[in-house]
């Protein structure tokens, strides 16, 4: 059982554990999200992502979650259960990112560029909100990310 993001294979990640970690904090996160009209991982970001694009996109999205979302939210929360869940998610995201090696070949430029444009839509939506609201919303949308990642999961 592994993820196949196009040519990038990811082993050793158990999606069950990601869902368990997310569900442990979902109600808290989504209750704190007051801006229900906006969405960060909107349709245009994740809809019809080709296999070739998927490796670039998941790499940039998960790196953003690690460097911006988990890192900043970790400093803002003291609730042990919440910290434990975010730690599980973050550790698994690190494991995924560490196995992703998107091709930097020139012929992949258009695919890389398409994936980057999708990521920029997400980042722009994130930056339009104030920091606290953006972090909360990004965490509350981890289920959208996990659901999309299933498309690349192989039994």
């Amino acid at each position: 059982q592994e993820f196949h993001f196009g040519p990038c294979q990811v082993k050793g990640v158990v999606p069950q554990k990601l869902w368990e970690a997310f569900w442990a904090v979902k109600d808290t996160m989504q209750a704190q999200d007051n801006i229900t009209s906006a969405r960060l991982l909107q349709q245009e970001v994740l809809q019809n992502v080709s296999d070739a694009e998927s490796c670039y996109l998941v790499h940039t999205l998960l790196e953003f979650y690690l460097k911006t979302v988990f890192k900043n939210y970790h400093n803002r929360t003291v609730e042990v259960r919440t910290l434990k869940s975010f730690s599980t998610l973050a550790n698994n995201f690190v494991l995924i990112v560490s196995q992703l090696q998107p091709s930097q070949e020139n012929e992949m430029f258009s695919i890389r560029d398409s994936a980057h444009r999708r990521f920029l839509l997400f980042r722009r939506a994130f930056k339009q909100l104030d920091v606290e609201a953006a972090l909360t919303k990004a965490l509350g949308e981890v289920d959208i990310l996990l659901t999309w990642m299933q498309k690349f999961y192989k039994l």
């Epitope: 069950q16 869902w19 368990e20 349709q43 994740l46 289920d143 659901t147 999309w148 299933q150 498309k151």
Partner: antibody, heavy 119, light 108 residues
Framework: QLQLVESGGALVQPGGSLRLSCAAS????????MSWVRQAPGKGLEWVSH????????FYAESMKGRATISRDNAKNTLYLQMNSLKSEDTAVYYC????????????WGQGTQVTVSS | SYELTQSPSVSVALRQTAKITCGGD??????AQWYQRKPGQAPVMVIY???RRPSGIPERFSGSNSGNTATLTISGAQAEDEADYYC???????????FGGGTHLTVL
């Protein structure tokens, strides 16, 4: 070899209670979320309930909320569904299913157990 | 709540191609599964994660999912493919699995 064996189905009167069991073998039970899915006579498949591998997260279909409790005993590799205040519309074959992603990827199903609610 | 719509029945001539569709609001953003159910038997997953085939499932079964429609295609339908087929997704906003109403495939 992976196996899911349901039991506990019976003929029960409206308003009655029933506990279904699903004995699992051939895989590391607590690594996987599990669900109950049912099929009423002449109807389609209907999801009933879901429980995460660690048992901490449980979800129910609207039609069963407040009347059903899903649980698991990971030491015994067994999944349960306790149903109360049974109605005639609960008459169905109840299947347990192994979830291979954690959010509704049912790669393996048991053979089902028949629940009939009738006076 | 999220709903999936399937046509009740589809007929196909032996060895021809059958297409069974499943409609849902922006279903393309979700992962779709397809299950085959024959009378007196437990359901069998024939497609998962939109287009992946579990081991043991014949190559004639394939899937796609985009926009508001997921599609199960059986290329060169065989007599043994006559069954009910159900699409299914996970609705993460409701924490619930959702099944379509089912399509009965008749192989003529």
């Amino acid at each position: 070899q992976l196996q899911l064996v349901e039991s506990g189905g019976a003929l029960v009167q409206p308003g009655g209670s029933l506990r279904l069991s699903c004995a699992a073998s051939g895989f590391t039970f607590d690594d996987y979320a599990m669900s109950w899915v049912r099929q009423a006579p002449g109807k389609g498949l209907e999801w009933v309930s879901h429980i995460s591998g660690n048992g901490e997260s449980t979800f129910y279909a609207e039609s069963m909320k407040g009347r059903a409790t899903i649980s698991r005993d990971n030491a015994k590799n067994t999944l349960y569904l306790q149903m109360n205040s049974l109605k005639s519309e609960d008459t169905a074959v109840y299947y347990c299913a192994k979830d291979d992603y954690g959010s509704g990827l049912y790669a393996y199903w048991g053979q089902g157990t028949q629940v009939t609610v009738s006076s | 709540s999220y709903e999936l719509t399937q046509s009740p029945s589809v007929s196909v001539a032996l060895r021809q191609t059958a297409k069974i569709t499943c409609g849902g609001d922006n279903i393309g953003s979700k992962s779709a599964q397809w299950y085959q159910r024959k009378p007196g038997q437990a359901p069998v997953m024939v497609i998962y994660s939109d287009n992946r085939r579990p081991s043991g499932i014949p190559e004639r079964f394939s899937g796609s999912n985009s926009g508001n429609t997921a599609t199960l295609t059986i290329s060169g339908a065989q007599a043994e493919d006559e069954a009910d087929y159900y699409c299914q997704v996970w609705d993460s906003s409701a924490n619930a699995a959702v099944f379509g109403g089912g399509t009965h495939l008749t192989v003529l």
